[in-house]
């Protein structure tokens, strides 16, 4: 039950996280005009990864896409790449994790296969979250650098007669959405990896001890009162429901006590 809950919660948290990463990537407010300590302007400038916008006091908003690819800063291209990689990995991870969910039965899929898929999706979510966090952090660092550069020469003019105000940009809402979303995806991935450990097949410490009687072979299972005769019957991989005893090679979900499927 705990494994199912952990896996399910990990999936939901990752799903929210990836939705957030997609939202952040599409948002226009990655950087917004800094209004503090600036002349009061009748326009509000903000920029995203794909276009820049200007909201006028009149109520009009005009957005223009970055139609050039080569003319864009390398850092912006890197941020775009990181966010896209994050989305792609996250989307694949979601697809894999759907089939890995313990509560969903697909044919006769082994628990070991589900465990592997859970681990795979978990790793994908972790990498996806890290990509998003890295992308947002790179952009934030770029903003901080530009902010202080523009503060240093905020007013530039000719002989002090004519002044030009440089627009300073600060953190936009998309950065915070990206950081939170990346964090959620990361947490979801960790939860999936933890769930994987519970799903994974494990070697039991309960070893079957055989006592050879003179007449016929009887295998006594510790902790249980049932036995199986050894005449031609294959005891290997046969489940014996004996209140906790297991055969040597048995694949069992952990913890079995709490799995009411």
């Amino acid at each position: 039950m705990a494994v199912t809950a952990c896996q399910g919660l990990g999936f939901v948290v990752s799903l929210i996280g990836i939705a957030g990463i997609i939202a952040a990537t599409c948002m226009d407010q990655w950087s917004t005009q800094d209004l503090y300590n600036n002349p009061v302007t009748a326009v509000f400038n903000y920029q995203g990864l794909w276009r820049s916008c200007v909201r006028e006091s009149s109520g009009f908003t005009e957005c223009r896409g970055y139609f050039t690819l080569l003319g864009l800063p390398a850092m912006l291209q890197a941020v775009r790449a990181l966010m896209i990689v994050g989305i792609v990995l996250g989307a694949i991870g979601l697809l894999v994790s759907i089939f890995a969910l313990k509560c969903i039965r697909i044919g006769s899929m082994e628990d070991s296969a589900k465990a592997n898929m859970t681990l795979t999706s978990g790793i994908m979510f972790i990498v996806s979250g890290l990509c998003a966090i890295a992308g947002v952090s790179v952009f934030a660092n770029m903003l901080v650098t530009n902010f202080w550069m523009s503060t240093a020469n905020m007013y530039t003019g000719m002989g002090g007669m004519v002044q030009t105000v440089q627009t300073r940009y600060t953190f936009g809402a998309a950065l915070f959405v990206g950081w939170v979303a990346g964090g959620l995806t990361l947490i979801g991935g960790v939860m999936m990896c933890i769930a994987c450990r519970g799903l994974a097949p494990e070697e039991t410490n309960y070893k079957a001890v055989s006592y050879h009687a003179s007449g016929h072979s009887v295998a006594y299972k510790p902790g249980g009162f049932k036995a199986s005769t050894g005449f031609g019957s294959n005891t290997k991989n046969k489940k014996i429901y004996d209140g906790g005893a297991r055969t040597e090679d048995e694949v069992q979900s952990y913890p079995s006590k709490h799995d009411y499927v």
Partner: antibody, heavy 118, light 113 residues
Framework: EVQLLESGGGLVQPGGSLRLSCAAS????????MAWVRQAPGKGLEWVSF????????YYADTVTGRFTISRDNSKNTLYLQMNSLRAEDTAVYYC???????????WGQGTLVTVSS | DIVMTQSPLSLPVTLGQPASISCKSS????????????LTWYQQRPGQSPRLLIY???TRESGVPDRFSGSGSGTDFTLKISRVEAEDVGVYYC?????????FGQGTKLEIK
Amino acid sequence: EVQLLESGGGLVQPGGSLRLSCAASGFGFSDYGMAWVRQAPGKGLEWVSFISNSAYSIYYADTVTGRFTISRDNSKNTLYLQMNSLRAEDTAVYYCARLGRGNSFAYWGQGTLVTVSS
Amino acid sequence: DIVMTQSPLSLPVTLGQPASISCKSSQSLLNSGNQKNYLTWYQQRPGQSPRLLIYWGSTRESGVPDRFSGSGSGTDFTLKISRVEAEDVGVYYCQNELFYPLTFGQGTKLEIK
């Protein structure tokens, strides 16, 4: 057709109050920023105040700050200018204007005359 | 506050001749976000309300005759009338639309010689 009709002007004593109204029609009033502009007799244009479409942003000229209050009622398609502590230098024709592209004053009313005199 | 300086303050022109009005701002009106100049030109005919001619420094408002054109960038702007007609008589104002307060120029009175 966009129409802006100012009203409420008149003769008032110094220190007195007046409330100007601007009835708008022919456009989505709640979609646009609005402004008041005045023109003293024989003088140039002077911007007085601005209010955004949702009344979130409000700005005033230094000469009227603390005395004038701009407001709007989007349900009534009406813009207001409450003028208190009026002075002789506030005597002017007051125009109501709707903002357009580039924050320009795209449409103007016919104006209402406010005379501050004892 | 942004200071808008217009010149000349009075402009006598012969009908059919071109006219040019200059407007200088104390600060650049070029917005880096969209590379547009937030300067507007208005015409006020005698006894009438002002009328929008040009916005964004050079974009003509719909319905405005094409003999009116705006140019310039940053701090220096010009309004040109290619061939002055009798109906063009009035006062022309430039206005800063980027910074509050939204200051106007003193106005240029265009009259027929």
